[in-house]
């Protein structure tokens, strides 16, 4: 028998019901996929980041992205003066597209937006926009962090420098520089407006190689209100083949960003393959970890006033964010097998990063539906380091959903694990 | 190189108050867990406290009530009240790290009660 | 609360491996952690996470740990080596948590 696993992370009530629906219909579509000359890579797993330099070596190299910005240790660079942006405040056009590349949601730039300044050698081009977000509720999602400190959801824009090159992958294939600026969403209490188009698009691109045209957005409008204080370091790309060619610029000032449009982010889909179990998931936790900053040194823009009235109690007071109630990233590397006909053992690795260690336990929720009953059971594992727990009394024709959540001190708590849903007695796909 | 250091020991009579303060340097208190622990003379190493990167503090059963610890952006503070002759000790300020261990501990500040 | 038992002393000939124990009912599912401290000095992390050596500590320090005891290693033992060695682990939930250092373990090196 194979058993056939699809993983799914944590959702809302009526959600079994629901996923039987796509499980026997269509609605969740399994792809293969596509042979490709460019290696697999995945955020987590056998092709997780920690594997990523077997394929890419540059992943190994000492100026690596992304990386925690330290206020104190970021030095005033005279060179970093005012960002000179052209075209950020026009209307794009109906050209402009969104696309579910399944490890991201791309906005692929059609109109021209050129950015100098900033200590950038030229006048660069915007190709294209990208994001990175957490798994839920505005959990830690950003690929950069100032002070330890990160955030819900990162954009990120990649320039090119188009007096040299006539595209920004023949820049990228010429290991010549390119420029990125990071920006921080922050959760606020009301929508965003000027977000509107991008969370439109997200609901058309849910699926993984999903495209779609945008509704006009203004550029500008993504970016800070004030786009004095930045900082810049040299870099890498944050995802394979790594290449250590970016001028990263780093706004210290947040958007925001309400809770309802985080929604639309969490609610991508992406599919992956690990070993011969084919599976749709949620793409969340899309980040990189953190880089060591090595040799370099990070530089704070220099424009007067900037980082005056800045907010500096909201970047330092850990308190004031729902993420900060969030104790670590989820567990890990979800495994469910079963023991014998009647009891499985789940398994899970530690969380990768732990904002407010120790972890004392772990919550194992298991659901599981059996004549369209809805039944759900939790139980704590009082270990730190025991990282399994086993199933009894299992039906072999009953499906169900395995979740884990790390406790830690002051019984805070971790994001969710995956929500794996296993079932015996499946065909093979 | 990251470092911490305490101050504020001194010679005390019982019963008074006291107050310790560790200050960090090389890296921000503010990221990480702190700890404080004392080993009085001759003797082994006693955990205090701990307070955690939101405030949270955590004591050992025998110091709850007669010990508080708080911090700073750049410091955490060891308060002692109804100090007694038992209470002896040097008193290390610790860092908390890799979830389960003290990796970085001050030279300690040697407090001693004595009428 | 919870006890974690060393041994008080433990002697060992120079450049010989020797094995320290820490014994308590939560280790099985804690981590514990060692220290070394040398008279007049603060201690210093030597394993953390059962096995795990922070940068800069000797590869001849090692940790290991099988049901409830936990188990520093010193291989070619040194005459530096002999200081007091605790171990530590934590343990709770909610508000309720606690740490725990050993008794101590002082470790002669003979020869």
């Known amino acids: 028998v194979l058993h056939y696993v699809v993983c799914f992370p944590a959702l809302t009530e009526g959600y079994v019901g629901a996923l039987h629906e796509n499980r026997h219909g269509s609605a969740v579509q399994i792809r293969r996929r596509k042979a490709s000359g460019d290696p697999y890579w995945a955020y987590s797993g056998a092709y997780g980041p920690e594997h990523w330099v077997t394929s890419s070596v540059s992943c190994g190299g000492r100026h690596q992205s992304p990386i925690d910005i330290l206020d104190q240790y970021a030095r005033v660079g005279e060179e970093y003066q005012e960002l000179q942006l052209d075209g950020f405040d026009n209307e794009s056009s109906n050209k402009t597209w969104m696309k579910n590349t399944g490890k991201t949601v791309a906005i692929l730039l059609k109109d021209d937006y050129f950015v100098s300044g900033a200590g950038l050698p030229g006048r660069f081009k915007a190709e294209k926009v990208e994001f990175h977000w957490g798994h839920s509720n505005g959990s830690a999602g950003s690929e950069h962090s100032i002070n330890g400190r990160r955030f819900p959801v990162e954009m990120q824009i990649f320039f090119y420098n188009p007096d040299d090159f006539d595209s920004f992958q023949t820049a990228i294939s010429e290991n010549r520089i390119i420029g990125a600026m990071a920006i921080f969403f922050q959760v606020s209490p009301r929508d965003n407006s000027a977000l509107d188009p991008i969370i439109h698009g997200l609901k058309g691109v849910v699926h993984h190689e999903k495209e779609t045209f945008l509704d006009p957005f203004v550029l500008r409008d993504l970016l800070p209100a004030s786009l004095g204080s930045y900082y810049r370091y040299t870099g890498s790309l944050t995802t394979p083949p790594c290449s250590e060619i970016v001028e990263w610029i780093v706004f210290r000032r947040p958007v925001p960003i309400s809770y309802h449009q985080l929604e639309a982010f969490y609610s991508i889909f992406t599919t992956e393959q690990q070993d011969h179990v084919k599976s749709v998931e949620y793409l969340r936790n899309n980040f990189r970890p953190q880089q060591r900053l090595h040799d370099r040194v990070v530089s704070k823009s220099a424009v007067r006033d900037s980082w005056n009235h800045d907010m500096t109690d909201f970047l330092e007071n850990p308190l004031g964010t729902e993420a900060s109630k969030v104790c670590s990233s989820p567990p890990i590397h979800m495994k469910v097998q079963p023991l014998n006909q009647t009891a499985l053992q789940v398994s899970w690795s530690q969380p990768e990063t732990i904002y407010h260690p120790p972890i004392m336990n772990y919550m194992i929720s298991y659901s599981w539906t059996k004549n369209e009953d809805e039944k759900e059971k939790t139980f704590t594992k009082d270990s730190d380091k025991d990282l399994k727990a086993t199933i009894s009394h299992v039906s072999p024709d009953s499906l169900y959903l395995f979740r884990v959540q790390a406790v830690c001190r002051n019984d805070m708590r971790s994001d969710f694990s995956q929500t794996m849903l296993f079932q015996a007695n499946t065909t093979r796909i | 190189a990251q470092s911490l250091e305490e101050f504020g020991g001194r010679l005390a009579t019982p019963g008074t108050p006291l107050t310790l303060t560790c200050t960090a340097s090389g890296f921000s208190l503010g990221t990480y867990s702190m700890s404080w622990v004392r080993q009085a003379p001759g003797k082994g190493l006693e955990w205090i406290g701990t307070?955690?990167?939101?405030?949270d503090a955590y004591y050992a059963s025998w110091a709850k009530g007669r010990f508080t610890i708080s911090r700073t952006s750049t410091t955490v503070d060891l308060k002692m009240t109804s100090l007694a002759t038992e209470d002896t000790a040097t008193y290390f300020c610790v860092r908390e790290n890799y979830g389960y261990a003290f990796d970085i501990w001050g030279p300690g500040t040697l407090v001693t009660i004595s009428s | 609360s919870f006890v974690l038992t060393q041994p008080a002393s433990v002697q060992v000939n120079l450049g010989q491996t020797v094995s320290l124990t820490c014994t308590a009912d939560?280790?099985?599912?804690?981590?514990a952690s060692w220290y070394q401290q040398k008279p007049g000095q603060a201690p210093v992390l030597l394993i953390y996470r059962d096995t795990s050596r922070p940068s800069g500590v000797p590869d001849r320090f090692s940790g290991s740990s099988s049901g409830n005891t936990a188990t520093l290693t010193i291989s070619g033992a040194q005459a530096g080596d002999e200081a007091d060695y605790y171990c530590a682990t934590s343990d709770g939930s909610g508000s309720s948590y606690q740490c725990v250092f050993g008794g101590g373990t002082q470790l002669t090196v003979t020869g």
């Open positions: 939560t280790l099985s599912r804690r981590y």
């Open positions: 307070i955690g990167g939101r405030g």
